[in-house]
């Protein structure tokens, strides 16, 4: 039994790090392998992660960790019974993949504006809480070409867009993901998408008399 692709890990900078690797053949990860991880200098015993299968020869392990401190460094030992297959280290702050935002909601009660809001996935005392920026993806279910990305570079987890920028009378979906420049993170996974019907109709009178003013909104 050998490791074909060495473990690579990402941290959510909160409580979970996820490590993935590939073996040289089909493996029952949970019964044959154990990933031991220990904070460097920690005097208590190493923690054990029981991996799950991730495809035939792939394994994935979710390492439960304490709050991350930027200097944290972990040793990783991959064991098959009494055989040490691989030894490495992992610094969570250098491999951050933020948690996905949640609770994405589209508020359509303001006649000419769509307000999208979502929740920051971190508690206020986590360093990433004030360092996330977002990308919002909106697309039409009817027209695959109608696909747009809005970059939200301010801290507030919300986006306002003019309803008139979307086609009227059709259904749209939206999703949001996050990243943090300070730790040069990867993007988070996308949030679950939410669907709404864009029923915005620009009244003829308003369009006629306030056309210029409308485009300044």
């Amino acid at each position: 039994m050998k490791v074909l692709q060495e473990p690579t890990c990402v941290s959510d900078y909160m409580s979970i790090s996820t490590c993935e690797w590939k073996m040289n053949g089909p493996t029952n990860c949970s019964t044959e392998l154990r990933l031991l991880y220990q904070l460097v200098f920690l005097l208590s015993e190493a923690h054990t992660c029981i991996p799950e299968n991730n495809g035939g020869a792939g394994c994935v392990c979710h390492l439960l960790m304490d709050d991350v401190v930027s200097a944290d460094n972990y040793t990783l030992d991959l064991w098959a019974g009494q055989q040490l297959l691989w030894k490495g280290s992992f610094k969570p702050s250098e491999h951050v993949k933020p948690r996905a935002p949640g609770n994405l909601t589209v508020h359509t009660n303001v006649s000419d504006t769509l307000l999208l809001t979502w929740s920051n996935p971190y508690p206020p005392d986590n360093y990433l809480y004030n360092h996330l920026t977002y990308a919002v993806n909106i697309w039409s279910e009817n027209d695959p070409a109608d696909f747009r990305i809005y970059n939200v570079t301010y801290l507030e987890p919300s986006l306002r867009i003019a309803a008139s920028t979307l086609k009227s009378g059709i259904s749209y979906r939206a999703r949001v993901r996050a990243w943090a420049q300070c730790y040069n993170t990867t993007w988070s996974e996308w949030s679950p998408s939410t669907k709404w019907h864009n029923s915005y109709r620009e009244p003829f009178e308003q369009h006629h008399h306030h056309h210029h003013h409308h485009h300044h909104h």
């Epitope: 005097l43 208590s44 960790m65």
Partner: antibody, heavy 119, light 108 residues
Framework: EVQLVESGGGLVQPGGSLKLSCAAS????????MSWVRQTPDKRLELVAT????????SYPDSVKGRFTISRDNAKNTLYLQMSSLKSEDTAMFYC????????????WGQGTSVTVSS | DIQMTQSPASLSASVGETVTITCRTS??????LAWYQQKQGKSPQFLVY???TLAEGVPSRFSGSGSGTQFSLNINSLQSEDFGSYYC??????????FGGGTKLEIK
């Protein structure tokens, strides 16, 4: 309930020896790092010895190095501190403490045992 | 060894007041700092770790903050059971970890 109970303290003459014990219960002793911390009469705290979960790694500050030895018996759930060549400045309350599972902070402390070094 | 400077050495306050105790380190310890409370005649009790995370069962009127070399422990709306001594301790790097000199919090 986590419990740490120290014993073995007492009055000893300068140059003498003493062995402290700490009986642990209420947790899986063999998975935790342990330490001895002393509190001097002026109420200062000093970490005097640490040991990792399997007993394979120990550490001491310069003030006690070569005179104090920390050890553990995981089968008996007991931590020890062997002290020799004792000096008057070793007079203190000695606490046994458990290291937190994720960090090297001490989450549980015993009630302490008093050591007085005097002629 | 890293030096820990705790201040003030003592302070008096009344029930209901807010107090702040500070701890300064001689070098960067990131957030590897713990706080302990010790009541008269008792052993120290674990309060805070990673500079800001409350230990299990610690009331929310306690809060820790800081990183690098400057840290503080805040106690909002002091209760009678909060009086005693407080100590900071760093656990950065190999085990040559040191404590601050302590702060004695007394009833005014």
């Amino acid at each position: 309930e986590v419990q740490l109970v120290e014993s073995g303290g007492g009055l000893v003459q300068p140059g003498g020896s003493l062995k402290l014990s700490c009986a642990a219960s209420g947790f899986t002793f063999s998975t935790y790092g342990m330490s001895w911390v002393r509190q001097t009469p002026d109420k200062r705290l000093e970490l005097v010895a640490t040991i990792n979960s399997n007993g394979g790694s120990t550490s001491y500050p310069d003030s006690v190095k070569g005179r104090f030895t920390i050890s553990r018996d995981n089968a008996k759930n007991t931590l020890y501190l062997q002290m020799s060549s004792l000096k008057s400045e070793d007079t203190a309350m000695f606490y046994c403490a458990r290291f937190f599972r994720f960090r090297n902070a001490m989450d549980y402390w015993g009630q302490g045992t008093s050591v007085t070094v005097s002629s | 060894d890293i030096q820990m400077t705790q201040s003030p050495a003592s302070l008096s306050a009344s029930v209901g007041e807010t107090v702040t105790i500070t701890c300064r380190t001689s070098e960067n310890i990131y957030s590897y700092l713990a706080w302990y409370q010790q009541k008269q005649g008792k052993s120290p009790q674990f309060l805070v770790y990673n500079a800001k995370t409350l230990a299990e069962g610690v009331p929310s009127r306690f809060s820790g903050s800081g990183s690098g070399t400057q840290f503080s422990l805040n106690i909002n709306s002091l209760q009678s059971e909060d009086f005693g001594s407080y100590y900071c301790q760093h656990y950065y790097g190999p085990p040559t970890w040191t404590f601050g000199g302590g702060t004695k919090l007394e009833i005014k």
